[in-house]
């Protein structure tokens, strides 16, 4: 059937529309287009004869129509009057006519709308505002947007006048937003510029900042007032009811106790005519004195004396605070505070109690700190140390020994050789030594304040021959895969080379072996059972060499997963069952057995005579090494067959 499709159906003024013909018959003579719903010669727009491939304009032709050879009609520069029906009259070669009617609607291109308002400055909680979208346009739909969102659902929002008017009842400050209206018709949609609603509100109750109400004499008072308000509020300050100034900030330098009182901020909105006030009470305190610390013992002796530190001056109704090393007081049974916290007592002082100590006085506003105090704790001398640590020297070298002992005040030193006083110095120097300089070298340290003395003795050997070295170990029974062992070759000797052998071989290359301390120390990391070997160290210099006796490393390991023998698991009734359990372990492990989960005997061998099918089950061997603290086990299934059957033996 011949049909007409309008593309588009809704046409904007000034645009174009195509009346598209569907199902055009074959064998045509020509066709004509008419304005309206019927064929009317006076309303012919255009005709087209296929034989001449030529169009002829009719009385209703406006110059804006173009006919296509497929009978479709294009109308350009559409005007409002083009709205309506169009009829195509098709003349077939057999002179039988066919007609079809199509239609389209013409709508104006909408202008950009604008918003008018009945109240440019509405007052919060009092006024209503009506926005109207201009101009009024027929066949147009009106939409509203608030902050580019569609209208929220609210009982205070009402649309009227065909949605052209948006009324906001009882406006609030939250209605201060961007409002846009949009006009739509089938061919266009236009949005207005945004209108910002200027809601007058406030002032709200002002806030005074800072919130601080306590001040010290001599400080500056700087108060700021703010109240939410549109337009911005005008501010006034009152002190104890007396007007001061019309500013948002109140500044009083160098305040005194006399500036204590009630401070009122008044906020005024000239447009709404409303006033709101807020009052804050300011208290000004006199400046307290700076505290200081007194001590009952300026030179206490370590582990003997107690010290009492007192925070001065004594002030009633005052909180005292203490700090040690810039930290609050640690919890310690040796630290005691008096009831009022003013006195801190250190019981049995140690050298670590030197401080510094500070006390503080808390007032309403802040804490005043004392200057730091450092305790002069007398201690020592500790056992002196003689360096260097060498005990063996070759003839002809210089002997230079130094002594040091921790002490306050610093220790006084004396040297004795074989019990004879040599000199009162911290260092002892003997040049070009011989075998005769071998002997006992004693350093004596004396603390004159405490009267205490301590001595250390060192044996010095002067010999051309090196002594036979020995190996010391930091761990005589290391555990496999857990411990490290450090072997050290003794003695420490000057200008000496240290060497190591394992099982008579030079050291293997291994990431687990590390030499240090001038090769004097050999460390084995993460020892294994394979490290249980003979270790020998050697020392040599240009004239002699010597080796230590071997030291065998006793590595604790295991127990490994045990093995039950024999491997058989099938037995004939009446046979003897003799199971032996073995696990690699150092020291040897303790063995125990369980049959079907029931503990049996603590032996390495389990023997059961003349077994029967009742002895079927699981046989578990448990091993434990008390030295390594490790355990292991294995389970074996035993099957006992009645006599006469011959089960295949299986391992």
């Amino acid at each position: 059937k011949l049909t007409i499709e309008s593309t588009p159906f809704n046409v904007a003024e000034g645009k174009e529309v195509l009346l598209l013909v569907h199902n055009l018959p074959q064998h045509l003579f020509g066709y004509s287009w008419y304005k309206g719903e019927r064929v009317d010669g006076n309303r012919q727009i255009i005709g087209y004869v296929i034989g001449t491939q030529q169009a002829t304009p009719g009385p209703a032709y406006s110059g804006r129509e173009i006919i296509y050879p497929n009978a479709s009609l294009l109308i350009q520069n559409i005007i409002q009057n083009d709205t309506g029906f169009y009829t195509l009259h098709v003349i077939k070669s057999d002179l039988v006519n066919e007609e079809a009617t199509g239609q389209f609607r013409v709508y104006p291109e909408l202008p950009k709308p604008s918003i008018s308002s009945n109240n440019s400055k509405p007052v919060e909680d009092k006024d209503a505002v009506a926005f109207t979208c201009e101009p009024e346009t027929q066949d147009a739909t009106y939409l509203w947007w608030v902050n580019n969102q569609s209208l929220p659902v609210s009982p205070r929002l009402q649309l009227s006048n065909g949605n052209r008017t948006l009324t906001l009842f009882n406006v609030t400050r939250n209605d201060t937003a961007s409002y846009k209206c949009e006009t739509q018709n089938p061919v266009s949609a236009r949005r207005s510029d945004s209108v910002i609603l200027n809601v007058l509100y406030g002032p709200d109750a002002p806030t005074i900042s800072p919130l601080n109400t306590s001040y010290r004499s001599g400080e500056n008072l700087n108060l700021s007032c703010h109240a939410a308000s549109n337009p911005p509020a005008q501010y006034s300050w009152f002190v104890n009811g007396t007007f001061q100034q019309s500013t948002q900030e109140l500044f009083i330098p160098n305040i005194t106790v006399n500036n204590s009182g009630s401070y009122t901020c008044q906020a005024h909105n000239s447009d709404t005519g409303l006033n709101r006030t807020t009052v804050t009470t300011i208290t000004v305190y006199a400046e307290p004195p700076k505290p200081f610390i007194t001590s009952n013992n300026s030179n206490p002796v370590e582990d003997e004396d107690a010290v009492a530190l007192t925070c001065e001056p004594e002030i009633q109704n005052t909180t005292y605070l203490w700090w040690v090393n810039n930290q609050s007081l640690p919890v310690s049974p040796r630290l005691q505070l008096s009831n009022d916290n003013r006195t801190l007592t250190l019981l049995s002082v140690t050298r670590n109690d030197v401080g510094p100590y500070e006390c503080g006085i808390q007032n309403k506003l802040s804490v005043d700190h004392s200057d730091p105090v450092i305790l002069n704790v007398l201690y020592g001398p500790d056992d002196p140390t003689i360096s260097p640590s060498y005990t063996y020297y070759r003839p002809g070298v210089n002997l230079s020994l130094s002594c040091h002992a921790a002490s306050n005040p610093p220790a006084q030193y004396s040297w004795l050789i074989d019990g004879n006083i040599q000199q009162h110095t911290q260092e002892l120097f003997i040049s070009n030594i011989t075998e005769k300089n071998s002997g006992l070298y004693t350093c004596q340290a004396n603390n004159s304040a405490s009267g205490h003395s301590r001595t250390t003795v060192k044996t010095i050997t002067v010999s051309a021959e090196l002594p036979k070295p020995s190996i010391s170990s930091n761990n005589s029974k290391p555990v496999e895969d857990k411990d490290a062992v450090a072997f050290t070759c003794e003695p420490e000797a000057q200008n000496t080379t240290y060497l190591w052998w394992v099982n008579g071989q030079s050291l293997p290359v291994s990431p687990r072996l590390q030499l240090s301390n001038g090769n004097r120390t050999l460390t084995l990391f993460n020892v294994t059972r394979n490290d249980a070997r003979a270790y020998v160290c050697g020392i040599q210099n240009s004239v002699s060499a010597n080796r230590s006796d071997p030291v065998t490393l006793d590595v604790l390991y295991g127990p490994d997963t045990p093995i039950i023998s024999p491997p058989d698991s099938s037995y004939l009734s009446g046979a003897n069952l003799n199971l032996s359990c073995h696990s690699a372990s150092n020291p040897s492990p303790q063995y125990s057995w369980r049959i079907n989960g029931i503990p049996q005997q603590h032996t390495q061998v389990l023997f059961i005579a003349k077994i029967t099918p009742n002895n079927n089950g699981t046989y578990a061997c448990f091993v434990s090494n008390l030295a390594t603290g490790r355990n292991n086990s294995i389970v074996k299934s035993i099957t006992v067959s009645a006599s006469g059957t011959s089960p295949g033996l299986s391992a």
Partner: antibody
Framework: QVQLVQSGSELKKPGASVKVSCKAS????????VNWVRQAPGQGLEWMGW????????TYVQGFTGRFVFSLDTSVTTAYLHISSLKAEDTAVYFC???????????WGQGTLVTVSS | DIVMTQSPDSLAVSLGERATINCKSS????????????LAWYQQRPGQPPKLLIY???TRESGVPDRFSGSGSGTDFTLTISSLQAEDVAVYYC?????????FGGGTKVEIK
């Protein structure tokens, strides 16, 4: 854009035949008729007739019957003018022209000069 | 056949001056059904094919400068060039497309004086 491109100049002897082609592009070939116009040297324009590109039906003006044939190959959007038994008086520029929707010739080929000389 | 007669045969006009060409048909080319005059004007510059200027006696083809205008009644028609330009030097033909066969006028040659 709409273009009509004609074949090149021809020099023929009397009694011979010539075939002038007119290749159309830039529009739907079968929607617009193709006209043929002759312009003898120094003379005016003379309409020879046209061919309906939709039906293939030719129309010849009196004086251009018999020796003159209009044809089409719509697969290559080309119209042809075939002149047989050429005479000296057939010497002219032959134009093809598209018949506009209203009738007048809205687009023309560049012309083909056919010279008949012994 | 409808005979189309143009006058003058040639015309010399100064640059910027008006040029007027006349065309007369031997019978009316007015179609009473739509009140249209079935007459066209063409311009042929030297060595080029003709170019459609005017149809329906007075409707300018798209892209044609507005200094070209056409007018006329049932049998008498005029092509006017309001201000002659150098590129307007050409031969101008009128043509009727009212009745088969369509016929051209003899042409008017326009030159610059």
């Amino acid at each position: 854009q709409v273009q009509l491109v004609q074949s090149g100049s021809e020099l023929k002897k009397p009694g011979a035949s010539v075939k002038v082609s007119c290749k159309a592009s830039g529009y739907t070939f079968t929607n617009y008729g193709v006209n043929w116009v002759r312009q003898a040297p120094g003379q005016g324009l003379e309409w020879m007739g046209w061919i309906n590109t939709n039906t293939g039906n030719p129309t010849y003006v009196q004086g251009f019957t018999g020796r003159f044939v209009f044809s089409l190959d719509t697969s290559v959007t080309t119209a042809y003018l075939h002149i047989s038994s050429l005479k000296a008086e057939d010497t002219a520029v032959y134009f093809c022209a598209r018949k506009g929707i209203w009738g007048p010739f809205d687009h023309w080929g560049q012309g083909t000069l056919v010279t008949v000389s012994s | 056949d409808i005979v189309m007669t143009q006058s003058p045969d040639s015309l010399a006009v100064s640059l910027g001056e008006r040029a007027t060409i006349n065309c007369k048909s031997s019978q009316s080319v007015l179609y009473s059904s739509n009140n249209r005059l079935y007459l066209a004007w063409y311009q042929q510059r030297p060595g080029q094919p003709p170019k459609l200027l005017i149809y329906w006696a007075s409707t300018r083809e798209s892209g044609v400068p507005d200094r070209f205008s056409g007018s006329g009644s049932g049998t008498d028609f005029t092509l006017t060039i309001s201000s002659l330009q150098a590129e307007d030097v050409a031969v101008y033909y009128c043509q009727q497309y009212y009745s088969n066969p369509w016929t051209f006028g003899g042409g008017t040659k326009v030159e610059i004086k």
